[in-house]
């Protein structure tokens, strides 16, 4: 018996087609992805093959103005239109709190939404009961298939799930649910979830009875053969894990941003064992036409976005200096504003010992692309912010050793004075440079804001300590020459859309007046 699994993950609000790098589509003839193009390919496969499931492994939420404006209603609407069979909850589905998940998505989705390791307690338990499920069994042709969901247990540190949801260890939570499916005589089981490739592989290895793992969160690109675009494969598709009980378990992921449609064919024997698995992600490029009816619907929904981008978010009473003459040479107040917004967006009261789980921010000055003039009545719009942060990136959470941070700050000024983009703007950090010293030895003082304290204060960076830092995904991926971050990071979790972080902060503060306050000094 053969099953075709079509899968997406980490789509992050890319409802419209995008450029090859998943930013805003500029040249339509070379654009990729988007729900209209995805629908064309899905329908083509549904018509050609008998047993097809369309699955999403989480993080539909967050990433473009679509989410900022529609807050998840767009996800439910277009996933319903594409007739998804199931979705697993990702960490970003909690970005607007539990209410921001329940109302627009859980109550409106016509497909099951899954997570076995999220347990509701307190007053939320009855409110959310049945709106998401640990597993779902679906009839597919003349067989039944069980799909069991999971979500990153780090979600409380990455999003805003509140205090009434407990995120359990994925493997511990999955096993009893898979066992339950076995008692229902369901012998073909897919684990669909959002915890990252390393956890996906562990699930394949450790959870008895799971036949296939469809994952997300780590934006992993797997491919067998010559890859069709710029993404470099992290391994073959599917990635085969040998389970502790000796089975070969295929593990798949489909990069991110709706650029690819994962396509996996699984052959089962009559006892539900996987006999063979093969496939590849399908690049959704312009050779695949956009479905006209979905495209028309997208255009209809777009109207509200255009109106939103010119509305006032808040006011500034000072000039927001985002000029390259400032931000690539010295502390600039636009950099301070952005870093403050980044930290504010990551406020999660961890426990009594910590005032927050993260206190530091770094931001490449070259990523700040425009100032904002306060003399236009002080008005700040989404459109203004899009000029400052035009790349559609995210502000991510990483864990780094102090020694890696020190290298990053040395890199920040290794060729100072050439207006290059690697000069770092900061938050929760005090740095002093001595440019008279040779490159690689210019950082003379590096103090960081404590987190394990009731009154935050600055202490010297410790080389062997592990620190959490908020930074642009561009830096996490080694951009602007920050190879040491990419090579040495200990953990990387993708965060919220950059413009959204800053716009939310400005809306919250209403009036802003960021200063240059001695975060970066030269001796």
């Amino acid at each position: 018996w053969e099953l075709t699994i079509l899968h997406t993950n980490d789509v992050h609000s890319r409802l419209e087609q995008t450029s090859e790098d998943s930013s805003k589509c500029v040249n339509a003839s070379r654009c990729m992805g988007g729900v209209a193009r995805l629908f064309t390919k899905v329908q083509q496969i549904r018509r050609a093959e008998p047993n097809v499931l369309l699955l999403d492994a989480g993080d539909q939420y967050q990433g473009t103005i679509w989410f900022t404006v529609y807050k998840g209603a767009e996800v439910a609407h277009f996933m319903n239109a594409l007739r998804y069979d199931a979705m697993a909850l990702g960490n970003h589905e909690f970005d607007n709190g539990v209410e921001g998940l329940i109302e627009p998505l859980l109550k409106e989705a016509k497909f099951p939404i899954l997570s076995a390791n999220i347990k509701a307690k307190g007053p939320l338990a009855s409110q959310i009961s049945g709106l998401y499920l640990p597993y779902k069994v679906l009839p597919v042709g003349d067989e039944v298939v069980g799909i069991v969901g999971y979500t990153s247990k780090e979600t409380p540190f990455l999003s805003n799930p509140g205090t009434n949801l407990v995120f359990e260890d994925e493997i511990t939570a999955l096993q009893p649910e898979v066992d339950k499916l076995k008692t229902l005589n369901v012998n073909k089981i897919i684990a669909l979830g959002h915890s990252g490739f390393e956890t996906d592989k562990l699930i394949a290895q450790k959870v008895r009875g799971v036949d296939v793992v469809v994952g997300g969160h780590s934006n992993t690109f797997l491919y067998t053969g010559n890859p069709p675009s710029k993404e470099v494969p992290a391994g073959k598709y599917p990635f085969i894990v040998t389970s502790d009980d000796g089975r070969k378990v295929p593990v798949v992921q489909a990069y991110a941003f709706g650029k690819y449609l994962g396509y996996l064919k699984i052959e089962f024997d009559e006892r539900g064992n996987v006999i063979s698995s093969h496939g590849n992600p399908i690049l959704l490029n312009s050779s695949i036409p956009e479905d006209p009816s979905i495209k028309a619907d997208i255009n209809k929904w777009r109207i509200k976005l255009d109106n939103y981008s010119t509305q006032e978010l808040g006011k500034t009473i000072v000039y927001l200096d985002g000029s390259s003459q400032s931000c690539r040479f010295r502390e600039c107040n636009m950099g301070n504003l952005i870093c403050d917004a980044m930290i504010n967006n990551n406020l999660r009261h961890a426990d009594e010992m910590f005032w927050n789980h993260v206190s530091m921010c770094i931001l490449n000055g070259g990523g700040i692309r425009s100032p904002i003039d306060e003399r236009n009545n002080g008005t700040i719009t989404w459109e203004n912010l899009a000029a400052v942060l035009p790349f559609g990136g995210t502000f991510d959470l990483v864990q780094l050793k102090g020694s890696t941070l020190k290298k990053a700050f040395e890199h920040s000024v290794h060729r100072y004075g050439q207006s290059t983009g690697e000069f770092l703007q900061v938050g929760g950090i005090h740095v002093v440079y001595d440019l008279s010293r040779k490159p690689g030895d210019r950082v003379v003082k590096l103090d960081v804001l404590c987190t394990k304290c009731r009154v935050p204060s600055y202490d010297p960076l410790k080389m062997d300590e592990i620190y959490k830092v908020i930074l642009p995904n561009f830096l996490a991926n080694g951009g602007d020459g920050f190879q040491m971050i990419k090579d040495e990071l200990l953990r990387h979790d993708s965060g919220d859309q950059d413009i959204n972080v800053v716009s939310t902060y400005i809306s919250k503060m209403k009036v802003i007046y960021p200063a240059v306050e001695g975060r970066i000094k030269f001796s």
């Epitope: 069979d85 497909f111 049945g130 069994v137 009839p139 003349d142 067989e143 039944v144 369901v186």
Partner: antibody, heavy 123, light 108 residues
Framework: QVQLQQSGAGLVKPGASVKLSCKAS????????MHWVKQRPGQGLEWIGM????????NNNEKFKNKATLTVDKSSNTAYMQLSSLTSEDSAVYYC????????????????WGQGTSVTVSS | DIVMTQSQKFMSTTVGDRVSITCKAS??????VAWYQQKPGQSPKLLIY???DRYTGVPDRLTGSGSGTDFTLTISNVQSEDLADYFC??????????FGSGTKLVIQ
């Protein structure tokens, strides 16, 4: 038209087994799941399990796991349910019913039912 | 397991009236509910699926509504042939199906 013809009523002794049949006509037997449902006198309906004639794949209500065995004979378009170790609790009318599903969101329902087979367990 | 509760065992009505039969699920089942009619001495017949979709040939006097945990089968302009037992069924927990205990419609 679609018809599900069930075998006649039966009187069986406690501890014995009985095999009920359900012959399908008017549609492609191997395209639809077949379900079995129990109804005790004056009581509600209780779902027993289902089988797909094409693959022979079965799913049972845990309660009936050791009680009911579902099989099919594709050549005669017939579904069978064997009930074993019968007690008075098993005295009931048993229905076979065709399962249809489709659409979006996925809907499932039992659209055609047999006339029922009455089983009486008595010594 | 999901329990479907039909709290009214009997409902009395008269010809031409409108009657509502209710069914409550023990947890959210979305719209994964079907309704069946069983006349005396007959096998059940499908009336409604997906909580509100009328099955082929079912008169539009019969209407299903509800979602989540509360579901209603409404019969308007009740006729003598509507005398029957009515059962709700949830299929949210597929492959486990559970039926309500039934409501007998009595026509005075």
């Amino acid at each position: 038209q679609v018809q599900l013809q069930q075998s006649g009523a039966g009187l069986v002794k406690p501890g014995a087994s009985v095999k009920l049949s359900c012959k399908a006509s008017g549609y492609t037997f191997t395209n639809y799941w077949m379900h079995w449902v129990k109804q005790r006198p004056g009581q509600g309906l209780e779902w027993i399990g289902m089988i797909h004639p094409n693959s022979g794949s079965t799913n049972n209500n845990e309660k009936f796991k050791n009680k009911a065995t579902l099989t099919v004979d594709k050549s005669s378009n017939t579904a069978y349910m064997q009930l074993s170790s019968l007690t008075s609790e098993d005295s009931a009318v048993y229905y076979c019913a065709r399962f249809f599903f489709g659409g979006y969101p996925h809907y499932y329902a039992l659209d055609y039912w047999g006339q029922g087979t009455s089983v009486t367990v008595s010594s | 397991d999901i329990v479907m509760t039909q709290s009214q065992k009997f409902m009395s009505t008269t010809v031409g009236d409108r009657v509502s039969i209710t069914c409550k699920a023990s947890q959210n089942v979305g719209t994964a509910v079907a309704w069946y009619q069983q006349k005396p001495g007959q096998s059940p017949k499908l009336l409604i699926y997906s909580a509100s979709d009328r099955y082929t040939g079912v008169p539009d006097r019969l209407t299903g509504s509800g979602s989540g945990t509360d579901f209603t089968l409404t019969i308007s302009n009740v006729q003598s042939e509507d005398l029957a037992d009515y059962f709700c069924q949830q299929y949210s927990s597929f492959p486990l199906f559970t039926f309500g205990s039934g409501t007998k419609l009595v026509i005075q």
